[in-house]
């Protein structure tokens, strides 16, 4: 039975040009955590292997950077990165845990006057 | 330039063991690699058997997990393969293989194969 | 586990044709996809990886494409070195699993 549960970040914004932390936590399981997938729509941007560290795909290798801990760190982004991007955390006996975040990636001066989502 | 070549006996009898080793040359064991065994039914169909990461740890295919160790000596660059109670169905050609993990997340070192059958 | 599809298993073509392989993922693999080409009593190498890119020193009339569960790899020109049995394989998640292969007859 997987009794987990996953937190996100949520709905975030950041400024175009800027970075932004994504951030997933897995939590209320003892399942051992195998890999963890990061996802943006059809595209996988990098696998966190328990045993083998991070790969980053090739499409993302200069503006994606592994961590903090199991998270990603997004650099110099654009508007064409505003989307979902999904977690997906594959344990061990559970099976597979999936948290999402949106990311809008604003304009700088909407960016400055509009709403903004602190990552914890 | 990497090389991995196989090393094992033919003929194996139903119920026993089977012990391969891996040489590895051009490459250290412990960079960044994973060491992986790799087998090959008559009939072409491939199996993914398990590795062994550079930093020792491993993960196996479930189908194989009460059956199957992989160990390695640092000091002479080699991993090995152990498959207890084997049976006919084991009669295969058997691959190591290096998994690149940082860039391409594949295969792209292997050995050259050793048959191995299972027979009294 | 996830399943690879390779619904054809022989493919006959003729030297200068395009022919394209495909394969089918059981669950979503995002662009986790490798594609390996073995010849006649040589060990598989590796020619695509992340569905869609070329690995070092392999030709560019081979190429990969898809995402999600469907990929497809291709050869816009063959020649008479590429009789090779063909195979995919996935890298989402452990076990990695591989399609059953599909073997390219020349004509």
């Known amino acids: 039975m997987m009794t987990g549960t996953i937190e996100t970040t949520g709905n975030i914004s950041a400024e175009k040009g800027g970075s932004i932390i994504l951030q997933c936590h897995l939590s209320s399981t003892t399942a051992q955590v195998t890999q963890v997938n990061w996802e943006q729509q059809d595209q996988l941007l990098a696998i966190c292997n328990a045993d083998l560290g991070w790969h980053i795909s090739p499409s993302f290798k200069d503006r994606v950077a592994p961590g903090p801990g199991l998270g990603l760190t997004l650099q110099s982004l654009t508007v064409n990165d505003t989307g979902e991007y999904f977690c997906i955390y594959h344990t061990y006996p559970d099976g597979t845990y999936t948290g999402r975040i949106f990311l809008e990636v604003l304009e700088s001066s909407v960016a400055e006057h509009g709403a903004r989502f602190q990552i914890p | 330039d990497v090389q991995l070549q196989e090393s094992g006996p033919g003929l194996v009898k139903p119920s026993q063991s089977l012990s391969l080793t891996c040489t590895v040359t051009g490459y250290s064991i412990t960079s960044d690699y994973a060491w992986n065994w790799i087998r090959q039914f008559p009939g072409n169909k491939l199996e993914w058997m398990g590795y062994i990461s550079y930093s020792g740890s491993t993960r196996s295919n479930p189908s194989l997990k009460s059956r199957i160790s992989i160990t390695r000596d640092t000091s002479k660059n080699q991993f090995f393969l152990q498959l207890n109670s084997m049976t006919a169905e084991d009669t295969a050609t058997y691959y190591c293989g290096g998994w690149e993990v940082r860039n391409y997340y594949a295969m792209d070192y292997w050995g050259q194969g050793t048959s191995v059958t299972v027979s009294s | 586990d996830i399943v690879m599809t390779q619904s054809h298993k022989f493919m006959s073509t003729s030297v200068g044709d395009r022919v394209s392989i495909t394969c089918k993922a059981s669950q979503h693999v995002s662009t986790a996809v490798a594609w390996y080409q073995q010849k006649p009593g040589q060990s598989p190498k590796l020619l695509i990886y992340s569905a869609s890119y070329r690995y070092t020193g392999v030709p560019d009339r081979f190429t990969g494409s898809g995402s999600g569960t469907d990929f497809t790899f291709t050869i816009s020109s063959v020649q008479a070195e590429d009789l090779a049995v063909y195979y995919c394989?996935?890298?989402?998640?452990?076990?990695?699993?591989f399609g059953g292969g599909t073997k390219l007859e020349i004509k």
């Open positions: 394989q996935q890298h989402y998640n452990t076990p990695w699993t």
